[in-house]
Protein backbone atom coordinates (compact mmCIF):
# COMPACT_ATOMS: atom_id res chain seq x y z
CA UNK A 1 0.00 0.00 0.00
CA UNK A 2 1.20 3.34 -0.64
CA UNK A 3 2.29 6.13 2.51
CA UNK A 4 0.56 9.17 2.48
CA UNK A 5 2.39 12.15 3.51
CA UNK A 6 0.61 15.73 4.31
CA UNK A 7 2.76 18.72 4.77
CA UNK A 8 2.73 20.19 8.34
CA UNK A 9 4.67 22.85 10.64
CA UNK A 10 5.01 22.06 14.66
CA UNK A 11 5.09 24.53 17.28
CA UNK A 12 5.64 23.57 20.85
CA UNK A 13 3.66 24.43 23.69
CA UNK A 14 5.67 27.82 24.52
CA UNK A 15 4.53 28.72 20.98
CA UNK A 16 8.35 28.41 19.73
CA UNK A 17 9.07 27.19 16.24
CA UNK A 18 11.30 24.81 14.67
CA UNK A 19 14.16 25.61 12.47
CA UNK A 20 17.18 24.36 11.01
CA UNK A 21 20.81 24.65 12.83
CA UNK A 22 23.33 23.27 10.81
CA UNK A 23 22.85 20.20 8.49
CA UNK A 24 21.67 17.65 10.76
CA UNK A 25 20.20 19.32 14.19
CA UNK A 26 16.65 21.18 14.91
CA UNK A 27 16.48 23.90 17.03
CA UNK A 28 12.96 25.32 19.02
CA UNK A 29 12.86 29.23 19.39
CA UNK A 30 10.38 31.86 18.71
CA UNK A 31 9.50 33.23 15.12
CA UNK A 32 7.07 36.09 14.12
CA UNK A 33 5.94 37.64 10.94
CA UNK A 34 8.25 36.78 7.77
CA UNK A 35 10.84 35.18 10.20
CA UNK A 36 8.33 32.26 10.10
CA UNK A 37 9.11 31.15 6.60
CA UNK A 38 12.27 30.23 8.28
CA UNK A 39 10.36 27.26 10.13
CA UNK A 40 10.58 23.48 8.85
CA UNK A 41 8.05 21.86 6.73
CA UNK A 42 7.83 18.45 8.13
CA UNK A 43 6.15 15.98 5.57
CA UNK A 44 4.49 13.53 8.33
CA UNK A 45 3.95 9.94 7.07
CA UNK A 46 1.31 7.59 8.13
CA UNK A 47 3.27 4.61 8.61
CA UNK A 48 2.98 0.82 10.17
CA UNK A 49 2.27 0.22 13.52
CA UNK A 50 0.49 -0.16 16.32
CA UNK A 51 -2.40 2.28 16.54
CA UNK A 52 -5.38 3.47 18.69
CA UNK A 53 -7.63 6.15 19.06
CA UNK A 54 -5.46 8.33 20.30
CA UNK A 55 -1.92 7.51 19.45
CA UNK A 56 -1.48 7.47 15.51
CA UNK A 57 2.50 6.01 14.46
CA UNK A 58 4.15 8.90 12.31
CA UNK A 59 6.97 9.46 10.34
CA UNK A 60 8.60 12.57 10.53
CA UNK A 61 10.59 14.02 7.48
CA UNK A 62 11.94 16.99 6.24
CA UNK A 63 9.56 18.70 3.34
CA UNK A 64 11.73 18.01 -0.16
CA UNK A 65 15.02 16.52 1.85
CA UNK A 66 15.79 13.21 2.55
CA UNK A 67 16.36 13.67 6.03
CA UNK A 68 14.29 11.95 8.61
CA UNK A 69 13.77 12.24 12.22
CA UNK A 70 15.23 9.49 13.98
CA UNK A 71 16.00 7.93 17.72
CA UNK A 72 19.17 5.83 18.23
CA UNK A 73 21.14 4.71 20.98
CA UNK A 74 24.34 7.24 21.33
CA UNK A 75 26.61 6.62 24.18
CA UNK A 76 23.43 4.37 26.04
CA UNK A 77 21.09 7.34 25.84
CA UNK A 78 18.24 7.29 23.46
CA UNK A 79 18.74 10.42 21.00
CA UNK A 80 17.10 12.14 18.56
CA UNK A 81 19.12 12.64 15.53
CA UNK A 82 17.93 13.58 11.60
CA UNK A 83 18.85 10.83 9.28
CA UNK A 84 19.99 10.63 6.27
CA UNK A 85 18.31 8.08 3.58
CA UNK A 86 18.11 6.97 -0.27
CA UNK A 87 14.67 8.87 -1.57
CA UNK A 88 13.97 6.12 -3.96
CA UNK A 89 13.31 3.78 -1.13
CA UNK A 90 11.84 6.71 1.36
CA UNK A 91 9.13 7.22 2.46
CA UNK A 92 7.84 3.52 2.62
CA UNK A 93 4.74 2.01 4.81
CA UNK A 94 7.07 -0.31 7.09
CA UNK A 95 9.72 2.50 8.68
CA UNK A 96 12.45 1.03 10.48
CA UNK A 97 11.23 1.49 14.14
CA UNK A 98 13.91 4.30 14.49
CA UNK A 99 11.91 6.54 12.47
CA UNK A 100 8.67 6.04 14.11
CA UNK A 101 6.69 8.46 16.18
CA UNK A 102 3.72 7.87 17.95
CA UNK A 103 1.47 10.78 17.38
CA UNK A 104 -0.41 11.20 20.89
CA UNK A 105 -3.63 14.28 21.20
CA UNK A 106 -3.97 14.89 24.49
CA UNK A 107 -6.71 17.41 25.24
CA UNK A 108 -5.29 20.34 22.63
CA UNK A 109 -1.88 19.38 22.86
CA UNK A 110 0.40 16.41 20.88
CA UNK A 111 2.83 14.38 22.08
CA UNK A 112 5.63 12.29 20.30
CA UNK A 113 6.58 9.18 21.23
CA UNK A 114 9.52 7.08 20.32
CA UNK A 115 8.41 3.86 18.98
CA UNK A 116 12.01 2.72 19.43
CA UNK A 117 11.93 3.76 22.95
CA UNK A 118 8.73 3.97 24.80
CA UNK A 119 7.98 7.14 27.15
CA UNK A 120 11.14 9.23 25.10
CA UNK A 121 9.59 12.04 23.27
CA UNK A 122 10.81 14.67 21.05
CA UNK A 123 11.53 17.77 23.47
CA UNK A 124 12.40 21.45 23.43
CA UNK A 125 14.20 23.52 26.04
CA UNK A 126 12.76 26.32 27.97
CA UNK A 127 15.40 28.25 26.52
CA UNK A 128 15.48 30.01 23.05
CA UNK A 129 17.62 28.59 20.25
CA UNK A 130 18.34 24.92 22.18
CA UNK A 131 18.23 22.08 19.78
CA UNK A 132 15.36 19.73 19.57
CA UNK A 133 15.94 16.28 21.70
CA UNK A 134 14.77 13.32 23.01
CA UNK A 135 13.73 13.52 26.22
CA UNK A 136 12.73 10.50 28.86
CA UNK A 137 10.58 12.99 31.38
CA UNK A 138 7.35 13.89 30.75
CA UNK A 139 6.30 17.46 32.91
CA UNK A 140 9.16 18.57 34.14
CA UNK A 141 11.33 21.62 32.88
CA UNK A 142 11.57 20.73 29.60
CA UNK A 143 8.82 20.63 26.66
CA UNK A 144 7.20 17.71 25.27
CA UNK A 145 4.12 19.08 24.18
CA UNK A 146 3.24 20.73 20.43
CA UNK A 147 0.45 21.91 18.33
CA UNK A 148 0.54 20.77 14.75
CA UNK A 149 -0.58 22.93 11.43
CA UNK A 150 -0.80 21.52 8.19
CA UNK A 151 -0.25 23.24 5.18
CA UNK A 152 -0.45 22.92 1.56
CA UNK A 153 1.59 20.93 -0.64
CA UNK B 1 -28.36 8.82 15.71
CA UNK B 2 -25.05 11.16 14.77
CA UNK B 3 -26.57 15.32 14.43
CA UNK B 4 -24.78 17.89 13.63
CA UNK B 5 -26.87 21.65 13.86
CA UNK B 6 -24.43 24.51 12.43
CA UNK B 7 -25.81 28.23 13.34
CA UNK B 8 -24.59 31.47 13.42
CA UNK B 9 -25.15 32.78 9.92
CA UNK B 10 -26.31 35.21 8.45
CA UNK B 11 -25.89 38.83 6.91
CA UNK B 12 -22.58 40.56 7.20
CA UNK B 13 -20.69 43.79 5.75
CA UNK B 14 -17.60 43.05 4.00
CA UNK B 15 -14.73 43.50 6.10
CA UNK B 16 -17.15 42.16 9.15
CA UNK B 17 -16.64 39.28 11.56
CA UNK B 18 -19.25 36.16 12.49
CA UNK B 19 -18.57 32.87 14.35
CA UNK B 20 -20.15 30.10 13.49
CA UNK B 21 -20.73 26.68 15.81
CA UNK B 22 -21.77 23.24 15.56
CA UNK B 23 -23.60 21.37 18.10
CA UNK B 24 -23.15 17.66 17.99
CA UNK B 25 -24.45 15.19 19.34
CA UNK B 26 -25.31 10.66 19.39
CA UNK B 27 -21.90 10.15 19.31
CA UNK B 28 -18.36 10.97 20.98
CA UNK B 29 -17.43 14.14 20.33
CA UNK B 30 -14.18 14.04 21.77
CA UNK B 31 -12.63 11.21 19.58
CA UNK B 32 -13.53 12.77 16.23
CA UNK B 33 -11.18 15.07 13.56
CA UNK B 34 -13.75 18.05 12.50
CA UNK B 35 -13.80 20.34 9.53
CA UNK B 36 -15.68 23.01 8.42
CA UNK B 37 -16.90 22.63 4.56
CA UNK B 38 -18.82 25.63 2.85
CA UNK B 39 -20.87 25.71 -0.79
CA UNK B 40 -21.22 29.07 -2.90
CA UNK B 41 -25.08 29.28 -4.11
CA UNK B 42 -25.23 26.89 -6.69
CA UNK B 43 -21.39 26.51 -6.89
CA UNK B 44 -19.50 23.13 -6.00
CA UNK B 45 -18.00 22.01 -2.10
CA UNK B 46 -14.69 23.73 -0.58
CA UNK B 47 -13.14 22.56 2.47
CA UNK B 48 -12.04 25.49 4.62
CA UNK B 49 -11.12 24.78 7.72
CA UNK B 50 -9.93 21.46 10.22
CA UNK B 51 -9.23 20.19 13.43
CA UNK B 52 -8.54 17.19 15.49
CA UNK B 53 -10.09 15.51 17.83
CA UNK B 54 -8.21 17.39 20.85
CA UNK B 55 -7.46 20.31 19.04
CA UNK B 56 -3.77 19.93 18.68
CA UNK B 57 -4.09 19.80 14.91
CA UNK B 58 -5.68 22.37 12.48
CA UNK B 59 -5.52 23.02 8.75
CA UNK B 60 -6.76 26.10 6.83
CA UNK B 61 -6.54 26.69 2.92
CA UNK B 62 -4.66 29.32 1.57
CA UNK B 63 -8.48 30.86 0.51
CA UNK B 64 -8.81 31.59 4.08
CA UNK B 65 -5.15 31.20 6.25
CA UNK B 66 -5.14 34.35 8.62
CA UNK B 67 -8.68 34.75 8.83
CA UNK B 68 -10.27 32.06 9.74
CA UNK B 69 -9.82 30.15 13.09
CA UNK B 70 -11.06 26.97 13.94
CA UNK B 71 -11.87 25.84 17.55
CA UNK B 72 -13.68 23.10 19.46
CA UNK B 73 -14.95 22.61 23.56
CA UNK B 74 -15.01 18.92 23.87
CA UNK B 75 -16.79 19.46 27.66
CA UNK B 76 -20.06 21.54 25.25
CA UNK B 77 -19.26 18.86 22.17
CA UNK B 78 -19.55 22.42 20.04
CA UNK B 79 -17.31 22.80 17.21
CA UNK B 80 -16.44 26.95 16.24
CA UNK B 81 -15.12 28.63 13.09
CA UNK B 82 -14.40 32.38 13.61
CA UNK B 83 -14.79 34.42 10.50
CA UNK B 84 -12.75 37.73 10.37
CA UNK B 85 -11.97 40.23 7.56
CA UNK B 86 -14.91 38.53 5.50
CA UNK B 87 -15.32 39.24 1.57
CA UNK B 88 -18.09 38.81 -0.96
CA UNK B 89 -16.39 35.31 -2.02
CA UNK B 90 -16.75 33.84 1.38
CA UNK B 91 -20.50 33.91 0.83
CA UNK B 92 -21.39 30.19 0.99
CA UNK B 93 -23.61 27.53 2.65
CA UNK B 94 -21.19 26.61 5.71
CA UNK B 95 -21.41 22.65 6.40
CA UNK B 96 -20.15 20.88 9.33
CA UNK B 97 -18.77 17.73 9.07
CA UNK B 98 -17.00 14.61 11.25
CA UNK B 99 -13.70 13.39 9.80
CA UNK B 100 -12.38 9.81 10.23
CA UNK B 101 -8.39 9.62 12.59
CA UNK B 102 -6.35 10.39 10.07
CA UNK B 103 -8.13 13.47 7.40
CA UNK B 104 -9.33 11.60 5.67
CA UNK B 105 -13.26 11.66 4.06
CA UNK B 106 -15.87 13.59 5.91
CA UNK B 107 -18.90 10.43 6.92
CA UNK B 108 -21.37 12.86 8.22
CA UNK B 109 -22.79 16.64 7.84
CA UNK B 110 -24.81 19.31 9.29
CA UNK B 111 -27.27 20.70 7.63
CA UNK B 112 -25.59 23.60 7.23
CA UNK B 113 -25.83 27.87 8.10
CA UNK B 114 -25.81 30.37 5.26
CA UNK B 115 -23.14 33.50 5.33
CA UNK B 116 -23.92 36.36 3.66
CA UNK B 117 -21.58 38.68 2.93
CA UNK B 118 -22.60 41.96 1.11
CA UNK B 119 -22.70 45.74 2.29
CA UNK C 1 -2.71 21.25 -5.86
CA UNK C 2 -4.26 18.23 -7.23
CA UNK C 3 -6.94 19.11 -9.72
CA UNK C 4 -10.43 17.12 -10.04
CA UNK C 5 -12.31 17.25 -13.29
CA UNK C 6 -15.70 15.34 -12.98
CA UNK C 7 -17.34 14.61 -16.36
CA UNK C 8 -19.92 15.02 -17.22
CA UNK C 9 -21.26 17.94 -15.89
CA UNK C 10 -24.91 17.08 -16.42
CA UNK C 11 -26.20 13.96 -17.66
CA UNK C 12 -30.23 13.16 -18.19
CA UNK C 13 -31.38 9.72 -17.43
CA UNK C 14 -34.33 7.44 -17.01
CA UNK C 15 -35.24 5.72 -14.11
CA UNK C 16 -33.60 1.83 -14.52
CA UNK C 17 -30.85 3.41 -16.59
CA UNK C 18 -27.54 2.56 -15.76
CA UNK C 19 -25.70 5.71 -15.40
CA UNK C 20 -21.86 6.22 -15.50
CA UNK C 21 -19.57 9.75 -13.84
CA UNK C 22 -15.96 9.99 -14.31
CA UNK C 23 -13.76 11.61 -11.73
CA UNK C 24 -10.07 11.92 -13.39
CA UNK C 25 -7.31 13.80 -11.64
CA UNK C 26 -4.38 15.37 -12.28
CA UNK C 27 -2.15 13.50 -9.77
CA UNK C 28 -1.78 9.94 -8.73
CA UNK C 29 -3.96 9.32 -5.36
CA UNK C 30 -4.00 5.58 -5.08
CA UNK C 31 -7.03 4.27 -4.01
CA UNK C 32 -7.83 7.70 -1.59
CA UNK C 33 -10.90 8.99 -3.37
CA UNK C 34 -14.70 9.61 -1.86
CA UNK C 35 -17.85 10.04 -3.53
CA UNK C 36 -20.37 12.00 -2.15
CA UNK C 37 -24.50 12.73 -2.97
CA UNK C 38 -26.10 16.10 -2.38
CA UNK C 39 -29.93 16.54 -2.57
CA UNK C 40 -31.37 19.68 -3.55
CA UNK C 41 -31.63 21.69 -0.45
CA UNK C 42 -29.97 18.98 1.55
CA UNK C 43 -26.25 18.50 3.22
CA UNK C 44 -23.91 16.04 1.04
CA UNK C 45 -24.22 12.57 2.02
CA UNK C 46 -20.99 9.88 2.00
CA UNK C 47 -21.60 7.28 -0.30
CA UNK C 48 -18.05 5.59 -1.30
CA UNK C 49 -14.51 6.09 -0.19
CA UNK C 50 -11.63 4.29 -0.61
CA UNK C 51 -12.30 4.46 -4.01
CA UNK C 52 -14.98 1.66 -4.02
CA UNK C 53 -16.31 0.61 -0.16
CA UNK C 54 -19.86 1.93 0.22
CA UNK C 55 -20.53 3.15 3.38
CA UNK C 56 -22.80 2.52 5.83
CA UNK C 57 -26.76 2.28 4.52
CA UNK C 58 -25.79 3.05 1.00
CA UNK C 59 -28.05 0.61 -1.57
CA UNK C 60 -25.81 -1.72 -3.36
CA UNK C 61 -26.70 -0.21 -6.74
CA UNK C 62 -24.11 2.37 -6.14
CA UNK C 63 -20.77 1.08 -7.04
CA UNK C 64 -16.78 2.65 -7.51
CA UNK C 65 -13.69 1.85 -9.01
CA UNK C 66 -10.60 2.84 -10.30
CA UNK C 67 -7.18 4.03 -8.97
CA UNK C 68 -4.07 6.26 -9.66
CA UNK C 69 -5.98 8.78 -11.67
CA UNK C 70 -9.10 7.72 -12.94
CA UNK C 71 -12.21 6.68 -10.98
CA UNK C 72 -15.86 5.83 -11.61
CA UNK C 73 -18.89 6.20 -9.97
CA UNK C 74 -21.49 3.53 -11.01
CA UNK C 75 -25.36 3.56 -10.05
CA UNK C 76 -26.55 -0.06 -11.96
CA UNK C 77 -30.30 0.48 -12.04
CA UNK C 78 -31.12 4.82 -11.61
CA UNK C 79 -34.10 5.34 -8.89
CA UNK C 80 -35.81 8.33 -8.19
CA UNK C 81 -34.12 9.17 -5.15
CA UNK C 82 -31.33 9.24 -7.04
CA UNK C 83 -31.51 12.21 -8.98
CA UNK C 84 -29.36 15.03 -7.37
CA UNK C 85 -25.75 15.93 -7.45
CA UNK C 86 -22.14 14.05 -6.52
CA UNK C 87 -19.17 15.20 -6.03
CA UNK C 88 -15.30 13.61 -5.94
CA UNK C 89 -13.22 14.39 -3.54
CA UNK C 90 -9.69 13.36 -3.18
CA UNK C 91 -7.69 12.84 0.61
CA UNK C 92 -4.27 12.19 -0.84
CA UNK C 93 -2.35 15.22 -0.16
CA UNK C 94 -3.75 19.03 1.33
CA UNK C 95 -5.78 20.49 -0.16
CA UNK C 96 -8.37 18.26 0.02
CA UNK C 97 -10.43 19.21 -3.18
CA UNK C 98 -13.48 18.26 -4.61
CA UNK C 99 -14.80 17.64 -8.34
CA UNK C 100 -16.87 20.57 -9.48
CA UNK C 101 -20.05 18.01 -9.51
CA UNK C 102 -22.31 16.31 -11.96
CA UNK C 103 -25.84 16.42 -12.04
CA UNK C 104 -28.23 13.88 -12.35
CA UNK C 105 -31.37 14.86 -13.39
CA UNK C 106 -34.73 13.23 -14.93
CA UNK C 107 -35.28 12.87 -18.37
Known amino acids: APVRSLNCTLRDSQQKSLVMSGPYELKALHLQGQDMEQQVVFSMSFVQGEESNDKIPVALGLKEKNLYLSCVLKDDKPTLQLESVDPKNYPKKKMEKRFVFNKIEINNKLEFESAQFPNWYISTSQAENMPVFLGGTKGGQDITDFTMQFVSS | EVQLVESGGGLVQPGGSLRLSCAAS????????MSWVRQAPGKGLEWVAY????????YFPDTVKGRFTISRDNAKNTLYLQMNSLRAEDTAMYYCARQNKKLTWFDYWGQGTLVTVSS | DIQMTQSPSSLSASVGDRVTITCRTS??????LTWYQQKPGKAPQLLIYNAKTLADGVPSRFSGSGSGTQFTLTISSLQPEDFANYYC?????????FGQGTKVEIK
Open chain 3, 27 to 32: GNIHNY
Open chain 3, 89 to 97: QHFWSLPFT
Open chain 2, 26 to 33: GFDFSRYD
Open chain 2, 51 to 58: ISSGGGST
